[in-house]
């Protein structure tokens, strides 16, 4: 058993049929010595008396808020949560496996630039009695500070019969140099509590590997005289690291017809303009990627060809 | 310790092309190593990230763009002495700071070159003959060093008398290639910045 936060404890249980469970001793936080009784949750049934209560925790029915009283007055609370271990593996029931970029990916993180700011998100089908808390650091043995905000519900989607909820959190490395060469990864730890179930999820990454620029901005077309070609121009996104001559981007320009069955025309360039063949009902899209370190491409910025 | 804006004219910077070739070559070599050594811990997640130039050169700090010198987190107090001449400078206006930067890059390349050559000698003794260093990558390192054209003492190639542990050598190769790729990215960024300034 260990303390998650004040008055909240996690009991780690091997979860199998007829498992013996864990013996837990609860101590009432009071100078009082006698006349103390214990109850669980909303029940008025007295579980025991005395300053300490010894219980055998085997299942979720044994978890919950234990309260010690004296003469009708509440003295203190202890909330017991369960963390299940099945076949030597901690349970991952609360979050959905996003399976990208690989199986068992519960947390996904992205950064728009090298400033040390990044966003992580996760998915669940659970809508109520759910809390998250997020901690992060650079490295684990001698951790350097990363400050994370509160996790918030960022999107709701309907997937077949189920509703899916996306939560996200923003974090900022306390003293980040955009030009630094990372040798220690960022560690992100998410504590998830659903009712009386506790789970924790972790992710480890280098900022350079989770970079995904915003789409190029100010995408414009200039038709060339007496030609079916157009000059496409754009600018670096505002959120990208500066100076741009140091943090350079490369771009992919795509001409795509109205149908996915039509062949695409793609041009790759380091410049912020390109000349492509335009055609009726097609659209021109541009996306960006770090020129020197191939992490993710940005989303497309698009304009119609006409 | 930063790069001033008064640097060579655009297009007058012969190292940009070489640094791009370097990044391409090391990326290809790393990809080849990851494929060939698929049953070894050779991915970014599996290896320890070591920097053989740590405390010996300070390329990131010496080559910091002017715009980032206001960022406290980017300023490091480490001092390193550098030799200050070189043909990539291509301009009399070139400052001491830029010479410091390019000299640091040269020292990086020299250290990696020695490590890679030593490692290749060991890998050539491996009866499995599983992986060798791409001669193109070694040639590209050499070309960039020549373009930088700094005079510096030759570092003797390390030789070891004991029988090489080929497993450890291959792990070390992965660590070295990952670190060198990161440094090659920094070098490319620096050359691009200098070329544009």
């Amino acid at each position: 058993i260990w303390e998650l936060k004040k008055d909240v404890y996690v009991v780690e249980l091997d979860w199998y049929p007829d498992a013996p469970g864990e013996m837990v001793v609860l101590t009432c936080d009071t100078p009082e010595e006698d006349g103390i009784t214990w109850t669980l949750d909303q029940s008025s049934e007295v579980l025991g008396s005395g300053k300490t209560l010894t219980i055998q925790v085997k299942e979720f029915g044994d978890a919950g808020q234990y309260t010690c009283h004296k003469g009708g007055e509440v003295l203190s609370h202890s909330l017991l949560l369960l963390h299940k271990k099945e076949d030597g593996i901690w349970s991952t029931d609360i979050l959905k496996d996003q399976k990208e970029p690989k199986n068992k990916t519960f947390l996904r993180c992205e950064a728009k630039n090298y400033s040390g700011r990044f966003t992580c998100w996760w998915l669940t089908t659970i809508s109520t009695d759910l809390t998250f808390s997020v901690k992060s650091s650079r490295g684990s043995s001698d951790p350097q500070g990363v400050t994370c905000g509160a996790a918030t519900l960022s999107a709701e989607r309907v997937r077949g019969d189920n509703k899916e909820y996306e939560y996200s959190v923003e974090c900022q490395e306390d003293s980040a140099c955009p030009a630094a060469e990372e040798s220690l990864p960022i560690e992100v730890m998410v504590d998830a509590v659903h009712k009386l179930k506790y789970e924790n999820y972790t992710s480890s990454f280098f900022i350079r590997d989770i970079i995904k620029p915003d789409p190029p901005k100010n995408l414009q077309l200039k038709p060339l005289k007496n030609s079916r070609q157009v000059e496409v121009s754009w600018e670096y996104p505002d959120t990208w690291s500066t100076p741009h001559s140091y943090f350079s981007l490369t771009f992919c320009v795509q001409v795509q017809g109205k149908s996915k069955r039509e062949k695409k025309d793609r041009v790759f360039t380091d410049k912020t303009s390109a000349t492509v063949i335009c055609r009726k009902n097609a659209s021109i899209s541009v996306r960006a990627q770090d020129r020197y370190y191939s992490s993710s491409w940005s989303e497309w910025a698009s304009v119609p060809c006409s | 310790r930063n790069l001033p804006v008064a640097t060579p004219d655009p297009g007058m910077f012969p190292c940009l092309h070489h640094s791009q070739n370097l990044l391409r070559a090391v990326s290809n070599m790393l990809q080849k190593a990851r494929q060939t050594l698929e049953f070894y811990p050779c991915t970014s997640e599996e290896i320890d990230h070591e920097d053989i130039t740590k405390d010996k050169t300070s390329t990131v700090e010496a080559c910091l763009p002017l715009e980032l010198t206001k960022n406290e987190s980017c300023l490091n107090s480490r001092e390193t002495s550098f030799i200050t001449n070189g043909s990539c400078l291509a301009s009399r206006k070139t400052s001491f700071m830029m010479a410091l930067c390019l000299s640091s890059i040269y020292e990086d390349l020299k250290m990696y070159q020695v490590e890679f050559k030593t490692m290749n000698a060991k890998l050539l003794m491996d009866p499995k003959r599983q992986i060798f260093l791409d001669q193109n990558m070694l040639a590209v390192i050499d070309e960039l060093m020549q373009a930088l054209n700094f005079n510096s003492e030759t570092v003797p190639q390390k030789s070891s008398l004991e029988e090489p542990d080929f497993y450890k050598t291959k792990i070390k190769l992965c660590i070295l290639l990952h670190a060198f790729r990161i440094r090659a990215v920094t070098i490319d960024r620096v050359m691009s910045y200098l070329n544009a300034s």
Epitope: S227, Q229, G257, R261, E262, K263, V267, I277 | -
Partner: antibody, heavy 114, light 106 residues
Framework: QSLEESGGRLVTPGTPLTLTCTAS????????MTWVRQAPGGGLEWIGT????STYYASWAKGRFTISRTSTTVDLKMTSLTTEDTATYFC????????????WGPGTLVTVSS | LVMTQTPASVSAAVGGTVTINCQAS??????LAWYQQKPGQRPKLLIY???TLTSGVPSRFKGSGSGKQFTLTISGVQREDAATYYC?????????FGGGTKVVVV
């Protein structure tokens, strides 16, 4: 507006050959350009297409045939030629992409024989 | 992608009607064109987008269909229509000609 292919000749098997397509009366760089061939007495066979810089090839042509363009020409580079490659080679202009070929050259004959 | 064109040859009397079919192995929406080629000549585009007539092509030529099944119909066949006709279908990666249909006008 017209197209003309050049470079067709008698070659021995294994010899590389490059065919060139030039345009009159319009700018080649404004169009998707396609190469098609026709063996003597046979049907039309699509080889491949070049857009601004993207290229697409028939599966049998991949690796052996390469299409490239300059501002004034479109080239078809052929390697490892066999007698099966004997054909008239046409270049054609796409109205939108590469299936609606509205302008064709007269063709150039390539004969592969030992 | 495979384009199967039928029949391989067809005879028609002047004023008659000829129907040529083209079947795609997968859905190609309307990315299909019809070409006419006379002996010793270069091919000529008749119809594109499955049913759009190229300017200057007589209205007796009609294209129809979408997805996998396409048809070229020549109504009121003329002597000058004697030629080989090819369909050409395209998807997002490749483009394929049908085997051709030889039209003989008697």
């Amino acid at each position: 507006q017209s197209l003309e292919e050049s470079g067709g000749r008698l070659v021995t098997p294994g010899t590389p050959l490059t065919l060139t397509c030039t345009a009159s009366g319009f700018s080649l760089s404004s169009y998707w350009m396609t190469w098609v061939r026709q063996a003597p007495g046979g049907g039309l066979e699509w080889i491949g297409t070049i857009a601004t810089s993207s290229t697409y090839y028939a599966s049998w042509a991949k690796g052996r045939f390469t299409i490239s363009r300059t501002s004034t020409t479109v080239d078809l580079k052929m390697t490892s030629l066999t007698t099966e490659d004997t054909a008239t080679y046409f270049c054609a202009r796409g109205l939108t992409t590469d299936y609606d070929l509205d302008l064709w050259g007269p063709g150039t004959l390539v004969t592969v024989s030992s | 992608l495979v384009m199967t064109q039928t029949p391989a040859s067809v005879s028609a009397a002047v004023g008659g009607t000829v129907t040529i079919n083209c079947q795609a192995s997968e859905d190609i929406e309307s990315y299909l064109a019809w070409y006419q080629q006379k002996p010793g000549q270069r091919p000529k585009l008749l119809i594109y987008s499955a049913s759009t007539l190229t300017s200057g092509v007589p209205s007796r030529f009609k294209g129809s269909g979408s997805g996998k099944q396409f048809t070229l119909t020549i109504s009121g066949v003329q002597r000058e229509d004697a030629a080989t006709y090819y369909c050409l279908g395209a998807d997002d990666t490749t483009t394929v000609f049908g085997g051709g249909t030889k039209v003989v006008v008697v």
